[in-house]
Amino acid sequence: MMTGTIETTGNISAEKGGSIILQCHLSSTTAQVTQVNWEQQDQLLAICNADLGWHISPSFKDRVAPGPGLGLTLQSLTVNDTGEYFCIYHTYPDGTYTGRIFLEVLESSVAEHGARFQIP
């Protein structure tokens, strides 16, 4: 039975040209995290495999930095980066857990971070 929960940074906003850290955390399970995939709608941003290291998709190579930890740093933000991001935790023996983050990239300097929330 899958007992874990994914905690994410939730709904977040950031300024155009700035950077943001996408972060998820898996809790309430003893399952081993073997890999974390980061996706945006229909494309892969990055994969962090516990053994094989990082894969960064070529579309994002210039402005995605691995980490901190299993997270992802997205740099040089544009308004086109607005949208849903997913962290997919591959675990053993539980299977996969998915977390969702909504990022809004703002033109102005009124960007504020949203509250953290949990997805079961």
Partner: antibody, heavy 119, light 107 residues
Framework: QVQLVQSGAEVVKPGASVKVSCKTS????????MHWVRQAPGQRLEWMGG????????RNNQKFKGRVTITVDTSASTAYMELSSLRSEDTAVYYC????????????WGQGTLVTVSS | DIQMTQSPSSLSTSVGDRVTITCKAS??????VVWYQQKPGKAPKLLIY???YRYTGVPSRFSGSGSGTDFTFTISSLQPEDFATYYC?????????FGQGTKVEIK
């Protein structure tokens, strides 16, 4: 230029083990993950596992149920794949391949090593 | 494990023809797909990755597309040196898996 040079063909008996080497040159060995892929006669390619030479992190295909051991000697820029408890269906060409820096696509391959399991 | 199924398994065609190969994943693999070319007795060669980027030195007649579970590999105008077997492969999750291959033969 990047080169991956594998050890020569082997004929081994069922139940025995084989160890294939892959000597690399032309790049910084610890910066790229190394993989082993095999191909039985007329069959599709099959990923056996990979190793991150920087930290020894190792991920194997569970199909091989612990029969595969992948190691590296960083001082010699060489990767090794040992397959134990060999059976006839392990007869195949075994390839080493490296994946790119922060990229999982396997961009350079060894020439292949034919392993024949026969009594 | 994720199964990768290519179609067709083989095709007979002529120089100058357009060739399209499809690859279907048994579950979502996002854009984590690669295409290789293999000639008899030789190691595979990387052609396309992620799944629409041509590897260094690969001619522009080779292209790829797709996302999720459905992927396409195209040779816009087949050249004599293109007769070979082509494989798709996913690296979305381990174990990485390959399609069964598509053999492109001379008609």
């Amino acid at each position: 230029q990047v080169q991956l040079v594998q050890s020569g063909a082997e004929v081994v008996k069922p139940g025995a083990s084989v160890k294939v080497s892959c000597k690399t040159s032309g790049y910084t060995f610890t910066e790229n993950t190394m993989h082993w892929v095999r191909q039985a006669p007329g069959q599709r390619l099959e990923w056996m596992g990979g190793i991150n030479p920087q930290n020894g992190g190792n991920r194997n295909n569970q199909k091989f149920k612990g029969r595969v051991t992948i190691t590296v000697d960083t001082s010699a820029s060489t990767a090794y794949m040992e397959l134990s408890s060999l059976r006839s269906e392990d007869t195949a060409v075994y390839y080493c391949a490296r994946s790119g820096l922060r990229d999982y696509a396997m961009d350079y391959w060894g020439q292949g090593t034919l392993v024949t399991v026969s009594s | 494990d994720i199964q990768m199924t290519q179609s067709p398994s083989s095709l007979s065609t002529s120089v100058g023809d357009r060739v399209t190969i499809t690859c279907k994943a048994s579950q979502h693999v996002s854009t984590a797909v690669v295409w290789y070319q293999q000639k008899p007795g030789k190691a595979p060669k990387l052609l396309i990755y992620s799944p629409s980027y041509r590897y260094t030195g690969v001619p522009s007649r080779f292209s790829g597309s797709g996302s999720g579970t459905d992927f396409t590999f195209t040779i816009s105008s087949l050249q004599p040196e293109d007769f070979a077997t082509y494989y798709c492969q996913q690296h979305y999750s381990t174990p990485w898996t390959f399609g069964q291959g598509t053999k492109v033969e001379i008609k």
